[in-house]
Amino acid sequence: SQVSQNCHNGSYEISVLMMGNSAFAEPLKNLEDAVNEGLEIVRGRLQNAGLNVTVNATFMYSDGLIHNSGDCRSSTCEGLDLLRKISNAQRMGCVLIGPSCTYSTFQMYLDTELSYPMISAGSFGLSCDYKETLTRLMSPARKLMYFLVNFWKTNDLPFKTYSWSTSYVYKNGTETEDCFWYLNALEASVSYFSHELGFKVVLRQDKEFQDILMDHNRKSNVIIMCGGPEFLYKLKGDRAVAEDIVIILVDLFNDQYFEDNVTAPDYMKNVLVLTLSPGNSLLNSSFSRNLSPTKRDFALAYLNGILLFGHMLKIFLENGENITTPKFAHAFRNLTFEGYDGPVTLDDWGDVDSTMVLLYTSVDTKKYKVLLTYDTHVNKTYPVDMSPTFTWKNSKLPNDITGRGPQ
């Protein structure tokens, strides 16, 4: 049903869903802090623009009685329950921030007439792609897929002279929310990744993964997995690995690799880590000081959601346009705004663009080094280290199929 929005006469409210089920196990207090910090910045920016308006946030908490798993598995209905609560209280703001779980976002989008924008810190799955009023501020699975296909096809770099067309994907069901949907997208038979590969097999058991590492009859030398180095070590340990195995470790929301004193453990030498280019000013900010690297990105997405709303509000007010219109609801895309840590770009479908960074372990220094970067906005690769000190033969990434001749 149509809910009246608290979104006019110089007073603009943001509805923030504080759900028990969340993409990252983050205390809600930290998210509140991030939102409040964002509000302070927005108020300052609006004031500087000569716009004398009030911007506030209303935090809508789930009762937690039914949906209490804490992760995203039981989130499907929680978002709808919160929406019902908002509806009953007639407390809808100009914009909805949250949910972060793919299940709940998909269900909310499906079951409601969204005439207001929804901003999500998460909703990584392919089922949340191409939604007209949904904005996602953490890299969705589609962006990862496009990088991987681009990288697989590359054969014109001095360190990658073979096109790849095969892969194993390790997915055992215990992944974090982001990893679950990233791997789910790679597994899906109808996805772009599957369409572009000639061979792809999902490994679901630890033993399957371990056996592949030295199996002479393996169908691919490349294994994609998602998680941190510790996750890989638990699985791989100190087992011997065939010299032409390449493990691609997707660990987007972890900037520990860029810290000065970090040394790469020996088990990472056959691994390329895919992560995001780190922010700089975040490390010392008040809301992020006590957060782990992953949670920092999650809290930052909430903060940037507030800044995005402020950016759009400023534009519409300066143009004398109404906020409670479909035009406003559909406007949160194809733009760049000033985020907390620099410019944030959203693509035509409201998904955040970013610089992905592919790292390798230098056999000389035992440090993580940048091999290349990839701009998801223009789908372009930028080589960084043209002569990497790889563990692989001739300082080149091997062919994806053992014994196949040069390309």
Partner: antibody
Framework: EVQLVQSGAEVKKPGASVKVSCKAS????????MNWVKQAPGQRLEWMGV????????NYNQKFKDKATITRDTSASTAYMELSSLRSEDTAVYYC???????????WGQGTTVTVSS | EIVLTQSPATLSLSPGERATLSCSAS?????MYWYQQKPGQAPKSWIY???NLASGVPARFSGSGSGTDYTLTISSLEPEDFAVYYC?????????FGGGTKVEIK
């Protein structure tokens, strides 16, 4: 419009050093690797090394590892190459060239002539 | 390192004629890159990834080849095409250039 403007010609005595600059404009300096290429009279082009301005990663051609030192000043969008212990065989035109993968060396500076003579 | 051998060293032709420049690599490469250089000027990117024309290069130029043998072809020479052309590989590190083919007016 992308432009790479190099410093002027230099005449140096054997044993001296010279620092050649390459100022980039018309694009984001830190987005693209910068290469240095040598062209000695009557010789083929020789690639000397490449630097990534964003991360500071530098790869040298082994042949020039002890001869050239590549640096940059990102605030000035400028790359530098210093040649040390100059000898007559270092007499050449030195070019900087931007890497715009997949089109390697898509823009070149106008070249800096270094003459080593006693 | 990969050695690139260009032939002929000099090609004497008249405007309107077809020019075929060859570049042979000492070992197989995936792609070849070509540059044009005129006297007193810096080289210019001309063809990248074997067959892609760089920005502003006329359609009378084409590139082809695979493995160790690559060709740059000018279908009908124009006066401004007389220059030295260099091939270059970046398949192996370090990148290397050929010795050049000078296309001169007959």
């Amino acid at each position: 419009e992308v432009q790479l403007v190099q410093s002027g010609a230099e005449v140096k005595k054997p044993g001296a050093s010279v620092k050649v600059s390459c100022k980039a404009s018309g694009y984001t300096f830190t987005d693209h690797n910068m290469n240095w290429v040598k062209q000695a009279p009557g010789q083929r082009l020789e690639w000397m090394g490449v630097m990534n301005p964003k991360f500071g990663t530098i790869n040298y051609n082994q042949k020039f590892k002890d001869k050239a030192t590549i640096t940059r000043d990102t605030s000035a969008s400028t790359a530098y190459m210093e040649l040390s212990s100059l000898r007559s065989e270092d007499t050449a035109v030195y070019y900087c060239a931007r890497d715009n993968y997949p089109n390697y060396f898509d823009y070149w500076g106008q070249g800096t002539t270094v003459t080593v003579s006693s | 390192e990969i050695v690139l051998t260009q032939s002929p060293a000099t090609l004497s032709l008249s405007p309107g004629e077809r020019a075929t420049l060859s570049c042979s690599a000492s070992s197989s490469v995936n792609y070849m890159y070509w540059y044009q250089q005129k006297p007193g000027q810096a080289p210019k990117s001309w063809i990248y990834r074997t067959s892609n024309l760089a920005s502003g290069v006329p359609a009378r130029f084409s590139g082809s080849g695979s493995g160790t043998d690559y060709t740059l072809t000018i279908s009908s020479l124009e006066p401004e095409d007389f220059a030295v052309y260099y091939c270059q590989q970046y398949h192996d590190y370090p990148p290397t250039f050929g010795g050049g083919t000078k296309v001169e007016i007959k």
